[in-house]
């Protein structure tokens, strides 16, 4: 019987081809040269290797490149990428967007794995910032990618990249993230006219301050209730009834259905009941007529 560490006669691989799918693990180990594998990595993905056979091929590459694979190999990993651990990936230096796309394609249709998260982290850190092309690519594969970043990480997104962001990319963002993204969006879209500007900025308004909402109320934007409900409570509270009416336009009627939810509930509590009554929606809970409203925050500032 042939010793398992020696390649059987006539089985030495001259190239990476389909004949290897019949090789047992020990035969692959003994008969496939790691350097040959590295130079012909582009063929591996076209050959239906089993899960176990891919383990052997990975092991051979690990031995050849203990400090991490070169990008020429990484770009052609294909399904072998799914065998990589985050620790393996941390050794890589991935600079090409094409390489990133090739590896994301392998995981397409699946949730972001720890391997993919590590790959993206390595790539973005290597580039120094999240440029438009990268953001375009990442959000195409993972619409929720942007909202998975911390506010600190989002601060490295240049305003020009905001053009790549689609409304659905922001669905899972929290207020802290929108606080960072909104000023960038405002800068990115500043040269657009009123109605076009509102269409683009709408998804980011969860980070807008009061003064910007007041400005929008003067532009007949007809904000829908879904967008209004995502606004920062502290930004909505100072708005007058007239400003909210102008901001929402025909959608103002929707306030009644939302009167028990923030920020509408808190906003109602700050308005004079007289003013709320002018909307004719039956909103209740405003400040009764004849009551004096003291702004305690202002009083504290003066003392």
């Amino acid at each position: 019987e042939v010793e398992k560490t020696a390649c059987p006669s006539g089985k030495k691989a001259r190239e990476i081809d389909e004949s290897l799918i019949f090789y047992k693990k020990w035969e692959l180990e003994a008969c496939v040269d790691a350097a040959l594998l590295a130079t012909q990595m582009d063929r591996v993905n076209a050959i239906p290797f089993t899960y176990e056979q891919l383990d052997v091929l990975k092991h051979k590459l690990d031995e050849l490149y203990p400090q991490g694979y070169p990008e020429s190999v990484i770009q052609h990993l294909g399904y072998l990428f799914l065998k990589m651990s985050p620790e393996d990936i941390r050794k890589w230096n991935v600079t090409s967007l094409e390489t990133l796309k090739a590896l994301l394609e392998v995981n397409k249709g699946h949730e972001m794995s720890p391997q993919v998260a590590t790959l993206i982290d390595r790539f973005v850190k290597g580039r120094g910032q999240l440029d438009k092309d990268t953001l375009d690519t990442l959000t195409a594969f993972y619409p929720g990618y942007l909202c998975s970043l911390s506010p600190e990480e989002l601060s490295s997104v240049p305003p020009s990249s905001i053009w790549a962001v689609r409304p659905q990319d922001l669905d899972t963002c929290d207020p802290r993230q929108l606080d960072v993204l909104y000023p960038k969006a405002r800068l990115a879209f500043q040269n657009m006219n009123g109605s076009e500007y509102f269409v683009k900025i709408q998804s980011f308004l969860g980070g807008a301050p009061t003064e910007d909402l007041k400005a929008l109320s003067q532009q007949n934007v007809s904000m829908d209730l879904a967008t209004f409900m995502k606004l920062r409570t502290d930004a909505v509270l100072p708005l007058t009834v007239a400003e909210v009416q102008k901001l929402l336009g025909p959608h103002v009627e929707g306030l009644k259905a939302e009167e028990r939810h923030r920020p509408v509930r808190d906003w109602i509590l700050r308005q004079r009941q007289d003013d709320l009554d002018t909307l004719g929606l039956g909103l209740q809970g405003g400040i009764p007529n004849g009551y004096l409203v003291l702004d305690l925050s202002m009083q504290e500032a003066l003392s």
Partner: nanobody, 121 residues
Framework: EVQLVESGGGLVQPGGSLRLSCAAS????????MGWFRQAPGKGRELVAY????????YYPDSVEGRFTISRDNAKRMVYLQMNSLRAEDTAVYYC??????????????WGQGTQVTVSS
Amino acid sequence: EVQLVESGGGLVQPGGSLRLSCAASGNTLSRYNMGWFRQAPGKGRELVAYISWRGGSTYYPDSVEGRFTISRDNAKRMVYLQMNSLRAEDTAVYYCAASIKTADPDDYDYWGQGTQVTVSS
């Protein structure tokens, strides 16, 4: 444990087509490569189509290349074999099998019971 059940076999005229299906139950097949084998009377089992665990790559021997197509749907736990331009020599019992090791017939973990395909005028 995985159970494989083939269907779709039958009698077909030369030049005709058949589509075989293989339904898996039990454990997930997502990490298994899948193969279709055939065995004609008095002959050994012959691999006619083979597909990787993620479905991205396939293998066919020269005897069926260009005529047979293997595909899989991991979500539905199904594997298919589309057979076109059938010839008399394609007559055999066709088996579906799952392997995590190699494409070698001896290395398959699970086999179906087989479905008869007869090509005759």
